[in-house]
Interface confidence: low
Amino acid sequence: MACLGFQRHKAQLNLATRTWPCTLLFFLLFIPVFCKAMHVAQPAVVLASSRGIASFVCEYASPGKATEVRVTVLRQADSQVTEVCAATYMMGNELTFLDDSICTGTSSGNQVNLTIQGLRAMDTGLYICKVELMYPPPYYLGIGNGTQIYVIDPEPCPDSDFLLWILAAVSSGLFFYSFLLTAVSLSKMLKKRSPLTTGVYVKMPPTEPECEKQFQPYFIPIN
C-alpha cells in the first residue's frame, strides 16, 4: 500500500543539540520520520434517491486514540478532483459542516455517516472519503477507494398551468351541469303544482247580483 500518512515528531532538544545548526533543526522538525497508512473503507456503489440525496458510511481504522478528526469528501471525475465538503469534529461530538454545505453527517466511533443533498444526474461520479487524524500527534491520513454515486433525475412533472386549466374546465363543467339539472328539476316541480288551463276565457255571470245589475246572456251567431 502506498504511504499516505506521515508521522510528525516534536524535536526534544537537550543542551547538546542547542548547538546544532539551524538547518539540522529544521530537518528534524519538518521532515517526516516515519510513514504509516490509515485504512478508510466506504461502499463501492450508492444510488441517490429520487430527491437527489445519497448517504454512505465512511469507516476508518484508527491507529490511535484521535480526539480531533477531519473528514473531507472529494469528487473525482476523470482526472479532475474537487472538494465537495469538509468538516472537523471532536470525537464524541457531531460533525459540523458549513451552513451552505450540501453535506450533513453524524459520527459513531470510527464510522462517519455522510449524506450529500441536492444531487443531479450530472453529479454522478466517484466520491472519495478522506480522513485525517489531526490531534494528538502523530498525524495520519487515509483515503478510501471511493463510492460511485449514481444520480438519476426524476421524470419531469406535467406543466402545472396545464393541470390548472384541466381542473378549471372540469370544475366549470360540473357546475353548469348541476345548474342545468337544478333548473330542470324546479321547472318540473312548478308545472306539477299549477292547474290545467286551455287558454280560452269565457265570460261567466257572477254568482251573486252586484249593484242590481243584470247580465243577459247573449248569443253570437256564426254564419
Partner: nanobody, 135 residues
C-alpha cells in the same frame, strides 16, 4: 448473530502442547481479525496472538513468540492456536475475539501491532476455555 466458540482447553504438563480452536458463526471470517486473549486469576486480560483473515498477517505477544502459532481455516470458518512448550505461567482462561479489519491498523510495524493485541479493540468475544499447565 455473531458467535465465537472456543474448544481444546484442558490440563497439560509443563513442556506439553495443546491446540485451541475458535469456530465462528453468523459471519464469514473475511475482512475480520481474530485474536486470542488470556486472563489469569487476578490479572488483566492480555493479548496472546492475532491473525488478519484476508491477508494472513500474524501478531504475537513477546511472551509467546516462538512457542505459539496462530492459523486459519477458511473452509471451516475456524482459527487455531497451537501452543507448544507450555509453561505454568500460561495457565489462564483463553478467549477468542473478533474485530472487523477496518478497525485495526492497515500496516504492521511502527507500533501498530499494539492495537491487534489490545482487548478493547475487539467487538465480539467467545465464552473462553480453561488451560491449566501443571505437573
Amino acid at each position: 448473530e455473531v458467535q465465537l466458540v472456543e474448544s481444546g482447553g484442558g490440563l497439560v504438563q509443563p513442556g506439553g502442547s495443546l491446540r485451541l480452536s475458535c469456530a465462528a458463526s453468523g459471519f464469514t471470517l473475511d475482512y475480520y481479525a481474530i485474536g486470542w486473549f488470556r486472563q489469569a486469576p487476578g490479572k488483566e486480560r492480555e493479548g496472546v496472538s492475532c491473525i488478519t483473515i484476508s491477508d494472513g498477517d500474524t501478531y504475537y505477544a513477546d511472551s509467546v513468540k516462538g512457542r505459539f502459532t496462530i492459523a486459519r481455516d477458511y473452509a471451516k470458518n475456524t482459527v487455531y492456536l497451537q501452543m507448544n512448550s507450555l509453561k505454568p505461567e500460561d495457565t489462564a482462561v483463553y478467549y477468542c475475539a473478533a474485530v472487523h479489519g477496518l478497525k485495526l491498523p492497515s500496516q504492521r510495524g511502527l507500533g501498530g501491532s499494539y492495537y491487534y493485541l489490545l482487548a478493547r479493540s475487539y467487538d465480539y468475544w467467545g465464552q473462553g476455555t480453561q488451560v491449566t499447565v501443571s505437573s
